[in-house]
Every structure is written in structure tokens, then in C-alpha cells.
């Protein structure tokens, strides 16, 4: 209209979805009486009356705003509750008197989108793709207005780059009027991107200013060809027979190629394929010296059928051979001498030791053990230990039994055994000598003999305690080609006074043993008895 002043820019009111917008009518008293105002919403140039103020009283017009409008601030402000994205429009108030004037308010609506949801390509990306491949998708749901997406790689924003990086985004409007943004990052990746961290960021605005939300960081499976294959052996370091050894093929490609492990046949020099487990690992358990040799790995790319060979690797399984002692079964007279010699082979330098079997005492460091002026006590076991000092646990041993000719020698001469009448008594008697003696008993009972070692025998006798047996006692006699010897077992009745308070009188008296190492007494008594020391 000629002469009419140009409309001023509307006042901006910013509000978040779901909250209340306060639309303050900015007409001055000179422009209009605020007790008589009409409020309109303007949508696509179309004006719709939504609220009337008469004499300071407000009245909603029927329609979409009917339930959400109320008057505040003595009639100067219209409150719009439960704001939705559809409310983003111009509202105007029009004063009626003294002359028609209007005041325009632009309502801007905002809503932060949900956390961006990133999904990585589950099938991965080959580095040799002809064009950018889909790396990851990013979804930002229920934002208003449409948020902006930025993709990052290792903390740096990604820019569109022809044939290398392409970002494709689209948005959909939900029934609520909110936007869901979907974005897909397409890129040509290189091998170094296998560890790259990607994430997406949503940038959006609220009345309080600019904000952003980041997705979690993801890595992308990147496929690249193998350039090198190699062998790895576990455990690392010196290997020995008996170890569990794993030989595995490794490659610098993803996915790894199909592996096979071969060992060079020492006689034909041909590579022979070894049988690996389901994981392609060659397990040597237990490792033997025959496993030593030259191994290599072949990696076959099933896509290109290109085969790669590793550097060969020498495997050494260290060993100690069976230990040989000479003489193997020495027999000597008392007073004579004996030289024991120990031999073994190994992949490493060996150390020898001689030990007394019964005591574990080290007698000699070296392969030769010399024994002079042999006594019958010198009879028994001698052990040669061949070990590799540089490899803990790598050793072999051999036991040799030295026999000293002599008549039977009793473990004890006489012994007292506490008994109870009618109990079944379990007696034992031990003797040694060379040749090995046999043992007989002077009473009837169930006897059994056990050879303890080449010179030693143990006989056990089960016998019922009778008055006659108490009278006579029990004798065991050991004999061999060179003589005989006897041990006597005196039987004495147990009085209740000989029992200790905590002993069990019913079961505790059921057995009694006489052996060279323990007192020959009933298990129910703690009373110590003199033990004769004479043994021969």
C-alpha cells in the first residue's frame, strides 16, 4: 500500500519441543489497546484466527491450538504449551483500537536429536575396491530442525573427496514432525586404516546455542593382501624333549591366507606337509628329538591363488639319550672295589652326577663313581643323572643296583609287639642279602612275600593271637646260599592301663605291624618300647 511503512522483521522466540512458548504482544499503548487483541497464526501465507482478547479476557478459537493457549502477564503474553515442530511459524497479534496495528513473532522450535547410532560394515572393506565402499552408517533420530552430520577419522573431520570419500545423507520426517537423519560414509580405505577410529557427530541448535553429540568410535574390518608369511614357535627359547611345542604360521594380510606347514625330510631334502590342527597350528606334544629340523610355511590366497613361502626356520628339540651304566648289574664281595661309569648323548653339553638312591646324597660330580673297600651297607641303589645345565628340566637318569655277597641281614633282631587276645595280628619281617633271601615263619598263618629290591625282601604274616602264640612268640627266618638269620617278635598283652585316653580301643587294636622302619606295636598304644639296635 503506498505510503505504508515496510513491515519490521518479526521478533524471534526460540523454544524446545514440549516446552511452553511465551508470545509477548509488542504493541505499544499508542499502537493498540492490549485489552482488545486478536491473535493469528500464519502458515503458508494463510492467516488463521486462534485467540481473542476482549476486556483483558482471553478466548481460544476452535482448532489445533484450542487446548494449548492461555493468557499471561495481564493479557500481554499468549502462552502456547506443549510446543511441537508444526508450531514453527509466525504468530501475530493485532490491536483493534485506536487503529488496527499488528506485531509479528517468529516461533522457532528446536529438539536435540538422540545419540547418534553408528553401525560399521559388518562384512569389512577390501583395500582394492574400485570405488568408495560403504564404511559405516550413522542415524540421528528425532531432531529438529535437521541436524548436520560430520564424519571423523582418527579425530579429523572427513571431507568429500572425489573417488575417495563420499558422504550420502537423507532425512525422513516422523509423524511427530521430528527429523531422522541417516548418513552413510563411503570411502576407499588403505591398509593403514585397519586401526583407524571412525565416528559421526551430529551438530544441532537449541535456544541455548549450538551443540553436538558424538557416536561411539568404531574400527572397520579392512581386508588387504598378504605380503609376507612367517613361522612362530612357542615356547620361545630352548626346547626340550617332552615339551608341548606349537608351530604356527602368521601373515600380514587380512584375512590370513590358507596355511600349510612343511618339514624338510633330512634324507630326501624334500618338503613334506605336516598335519596341523583346525587352527592351522602344528602341535608337537610331546616334542621328540626327531621333530628337530627345518620347517617352512606356505600361505595360499584362495582369492588370487597366489602362494607365499616363509623363511625356513630350524627347530632344535634338545634331548638326552638313554643313560647307560657299566657294569649294568655289579656283584662284589665285601672289601673289594667297584668303578661305575655313566654314558649318555645329548644335543648340548652334559653334566653327570652320582647319587645314593636311598638317601639322595650326591656322591660324585662326574660320569665315574669309584667305590672302595665295599661293606655290605654299600649294597643297594646308585643313580646316575645326566643333565643339561643350560636347559632346566632336561635330564635322564639310570639306576644301578650294587649287590654285595653276604648271608641274610635282618632289619631287626628282636621286637616287642603289644597285642590283644583273639585279634588278627599283621606282622612283618624284612631281610636283605645277596643272593636275595627267602623268609619263613615258625607259626602257621597267611604269609606273603614282596621283593623290595634285588637284595631285599619283606614278608608279612597274618595270624590269630592265641594263648599258645603268646607263650611261644613268633620267629621269622631268612636264608640264602650263604647262610640264615632270625628275628624274634615277643608278644605282650595290652592292659587297659597301657592305653592312652584318646585312643580308640575297638578299631585301633585290629592290626599290629613289625617292620624295619616303624616300631612293631599295636596302633592303639603310644607307649614307646625299647628297640634293639643289633641288626646282623
Amino acid at each position: 500500500v503506498p505510503g505504508e511503512a515496510e513491515q519490521p522483521a518479526p521478533e524471534l522466540v526460540e523454544v524446545e519441543v514440549g516446552s511452553t512458548a511465551l508470545l509477548k504482544c509488542g504493541l505499544s499503548q499508542s499502537q493498540g489497546n492490549l485489552s482488545h487483541v486478536d491473535w493469528f497464526s500464519v502458515h503458508k501465507e494463510k492467516r488463521t484466527l486462534i485467540f481473542r482478547v476482549r476486556q483483558g479476557q482471553g478466548q481460544s478459537e476452535p482448532g489445533e491450538y484450542e487446548q494449548r493457549l492461555s493468557l499471561q502477564d495481564r493479557g500481554a503474553t499468549l502462552a502456547l504449551t506443549q510446543v511441537t515442530p508444526q508450531d514453527e511459524r509466525i504468530f501475530l497479534c493485532q490491536g483493534k483500537r485506536p487503529r488496527s496495528q499488528e506485531y509479528r513473532i517468529q516461533l522457532r522450535v528446536y529438539k536435540a536429536p538422540e545419540e547418534p547410532n553408528i553401525q560399521v560394515n559388518p562384512l569389512g572393506i577390501p583395500v582394492n575396491s574400485k570405488e568408495p565402499e560403504e564404511v559405516a552408517t550413522c542415524v540421528g533420530r528425532n531432531g529438529y530442525p535437521i541436524p548436520q552430520v560430520i564424519w571423523y577419522k582418527n579425530g579429523r573431520p572427513l571431507k568429500e573427496e572425489k573417488n575417495r570419500v563420499h558422504i550420502q545423507s537423507s532425512q525422513t520426517v516422523e509423524s511427530s514432525g521430528l527429523y531422522t537423519l541417516q548418513s552413510i560414509l563411503k570411502a576407499q580405505l588403505v591398509k593403514e586404516d585397519k586401526d583407524a577410529q571412525f565416528y559421526c557427530e551430529l551438530n544441532y541448535r537449541l535456544p541455548s546455542g549450538n551443540h553436538m553429540k558424538e557416536s561411539r568410535e568404531v574400527t572397520v574390518p579392512v581386508f588387504y593382501p598378504t605380503e609376507k608369511v612367517w613361522l612362530e614357535v612357542e615356547p620361545v627359547g630352548m626346547l626340550k624333549e617332552g615339551d608341548r611345542v606349537e608351530i604356527r604360521c602368521l601373515a600380514d594380510g587380512n584375512p590370513p591366507p590358507h596355511f600349510s606347514i612343511s618339514k624338510q625330510n633330512p634324507s630326501t631334502r624334500e618338503a613334506e606337509e605336516e598335519t596341523t590342527n583346525d587352527n592351522g597350528v602344528l602341535v608337537l606334544e610331546p616334542a621328540r628329538k626327531e621333530h628337530s629340523g627345518r620347517y617352512e610355511c606356505q600361505g595360499l590366497d584362495l582369492d588370487t591363488m597366489i602362494s607365499l613361502l616363509s623363511e625356513p626356520q630350524e627347530l632344535l628339540v634338545n634331548y638326552v639319550s638313554d643313560v647307560r651304566v657299566s657294569p649294568a648289574a655289579p656283584e662284589r664281595q665285601e672289601g673289594s672295589s667297584l668303578t661305575l661309569t655313566c654314558e649318555a648323548e645329548s644335543s648340548q653339553d652334559l653334566e653327570f652326577q652320582w647319587l645314593r638312591e636311598e638317601t639322595g646324597q650326591v656322591l660324585e660330580r662326574g660320569p665315574v663313581l669309584q667305590l672302595h673297600d665295599l661293606k655290605r651297607e654299600a649294597g643297594g641303589g646308585y643313580r646316575c643323572v645326566a643333565s643339561v645345565p643350560s636347559i632346566p628340566g632336561l635330564n635322564r637318569t639310570q639306576l644301578v643296583n650294587v649287590a654285595i655277597f653276604g648271608p641274610p641281614w635282618m632289619a631287626f633282631k628282636e621286637r616287642k609287639v603289644w597285642v590283644k587276645e583273639n585279634m588278627v595280628l599283621n606282622l612283618s619281617c624284612e631281610a636283605s642279602g645277596h643272593p636275595r633271601p627267602t623268609i619263613s615263619w615258625n607259626v602257621n598263618g597267611t604269609a606273603s612275600e614282596q621283593d623290595q629290591d634285588p637284595q631285599r625282601v619283606l614278608s608279612t604274616l597274618n595270624v590269630l593271637v592265641t594263648p599258645e602264640l603268646l607263650e611261644t612268640g613268633v620267629e621269622c627266618t631268612a636264608s640264602n646260599d650263604l647262610g640264615k638269620n632270625t628275628s624274634i617278635l615277643f608278644l605282650e598283652l595290652v592292659n587297659l592301663t597301657t592305653l592312652t585316653p584318646d585312643s580308640n580301643t575297638t578299631t585301633g587294636l585290629s592290626t599290629s605291624t613289625a617292620s624295619p622302619h616303624t616300631r612293631a606295636n599295636s596302633t592303639s598304644t603310644e607307649r614307646k618300647l625299647p628297640e634293639p639296635e643289633s641288626r646282623g
Epitope: 575396491s129 570405488e131 552408517t137 574390518p221
Partner: antibody, heavy 118, light 106 residues
Framework: QVQLKESGPGLVQPSQTLSLTCTVS????????VSWVRQPPGKGLEWIAA???????YYNSAFKSRLSISRNTSKSQVLLKMNSLQTEDTAMYFC????????????WGPGTMVTVSS | DIRMTQSPSLLSASVGDRVTLNCKAS??????LAWYQQKLGEGPKVLIF???SLQTGIPSRFSGSGSGTDFTLTISSLQPEDFATYFC????????FGAGTKLELK
């Protein structure tokens, strides 16, 4: 509207090669990837192979050595070849479209039954 | 490979019931999970993607929840057309499906 339709021989002899075709309409193979998924009678679903919108091929490692997936964009067809068939390959074979902004399958074909028998 | 375990394998329910189907992943898959419905003689139909997003055109009685390794599909009020087999699928690393839950009329 988006549609996928599988076609194949129905019956295949053991040790022979299976050729399946997935014909699509309502979208372009250069904007959406397509996968093949199979379902043995009365059993669950098993992903076999995929071809991306960019033409990159992917295979289930359990079948990799006997699979080949390809496409003819002008005919809107995705082809699957599987050799050395055994009776356990008897299944309903589906092709499915990968959603453009996600990694799930938003449209599936009705499937084609393949029986491996002599 | 990531294994997907669905429970129960068979579920009997009546029209109007609220039912819950479970899916467990053998490792953390964040929310890379979809639910499908399959009726006899048909291809599967996607219901839920990204663990909790409803596919366009799917009735709002279907909802998905969960993250990490444990996921749930809930049908708030069963309708006659909902009796079918339901599969979950992970797309975090490769593609693997659960063995399915058959929902039958009690």
C-alpha cells in the same frame, strides 16, 4: 515398489554346480547391496554371500571355496554359483536387499527351493 | 563367529497376550541387531532394526529392546496374524541368525 525374485533349477545332482538368479525391481543394484541367505528344511537362516552396491563380493568362509557371486546391473540380476553340492545343501535359497542406510535386510524374495539328490 | 541363541524355541500364547522373545549374543554386538518375522512359505520380513527401531509399516505393538549381548522382542497384544517364526540377526561382525522362536496359538 521393491521386489526380489529368486529362480533356480529346483533339483541338482550331488557334486554338481548350482546356479541361482535373483531378479530385482524397484531399486538399483548400484544403490543397494544384495545377499543370498539359505534355510534348510525346518532349520534356521544362514547367510551365504553378498555383493555390495559398489560391486565388492563377500562370502561366508564356510562355503568360500565353492561360491561365486556376481551381478548384471543392466538386467538387475544377482547371480550365485555354488559347486560340489551335497545333500546337506538342500534348502530354500533367498535373496535379500540390504537397506541403504543400515546393514539389515529390508526386503526379501519369496525364496526358491533347491533339492540336492541323485 | 558370533553365535546367536534364541529362547524359547517354542512359545504358545493366545490372542491378546503380551509376549516376550529373547535373543542372546555370544559377545558384545552393541545394538547391531534386527528381528524378522517369517510365515510358512514366505521370505522373512524385518520388524526391528538397530535393536529398537521399528521398521516403517510395522504395527507399534512390536517393540525391541536391549544392547550388548541381551535383546528382547515384545509383542504387546498378540493378533491372529502374529503367529509365525521370529528370528534375530546380528550384523556387528558378519551376519548370523538365531535358530528362531516359533510362536504358536495356545
Amino acid at each position: 515398489q521393491v521386489q526380489l525374485k529368486e529362480s533356480g533349477p529346483g533339483l541338482v545332482q550331488p557334486s554338481q554346480t548350482l546356479s541361482l538368479t535373483c531378479t530385482v525391481s524397484g531399486f538399483s543394484l548400484t544403490s543397494n547391496g544384495v545377499s543370498w541367505v539359505r534355510q534348510p528344511p525346518g532349520k534356521g537362516l544362514e547367510w551365504i554371500a553378498a555383493i555390495s552396491s559398489g560391486g565388492t563380493t563377500y562370502y561366508n568362509s564356510a562355503f568360500k571355496s565353492r561360491l561365486s557371486i556376481s551381478r548384471n546391473t543392466s538386467k538387475s540380476q544377482v547371480l550365485l554359483k555354488m559347486n560340489s553340492l551335497q545333500t546337506e545343501d538342500t534348502a530354500m535359497y533367498f535373496c535379500a536387499r540390504r537397506y541403504g542406510y543400515g546393514w539389515y535386510f529390508d526386503f526379501w524374495g519369496p525364496g526358491t527351493m533347491v533339492t540336492v539328490s541323485s | 563367529d558370533i553365535r546367536m541363541t534364541q529362547s524359547p524355541s517354542l512359545l504358545s500364547a493366545s490372542v491378546g497376550d503380551r509376549v516376550t522373545l529373547n535373543c542372546k549374543a555370544s559377545q558384545n554386538i552393541y545394538n547391531s541387531l534386527a528381528w524378522y518375522q517369517q510365515k510358512l512359505g514366505e521370505g522373512p520380513k524385518v520388524l526391528i532394526f538397530n535393536a529398537n527401531s521399528l521398521q516403517t509399516g510395522i504395527p507399534s505393538r512390536f517393540s525391541g529392546s536391549g544392547s550388548g549381548t541381551d535383546f528382547t522382542l515384545t509383542i504387546s497384544s498378540l493378533q491372529p496374524e502374529d503367529f509365525a517364526t521370529y528370528f534375530c540377526q546380528q550384523f556387528y561382525s558378519g551376519y548370523t541368525f538365531g535358530a528362531g522362536t516359533k510362536l504358536e496359538l495356545k
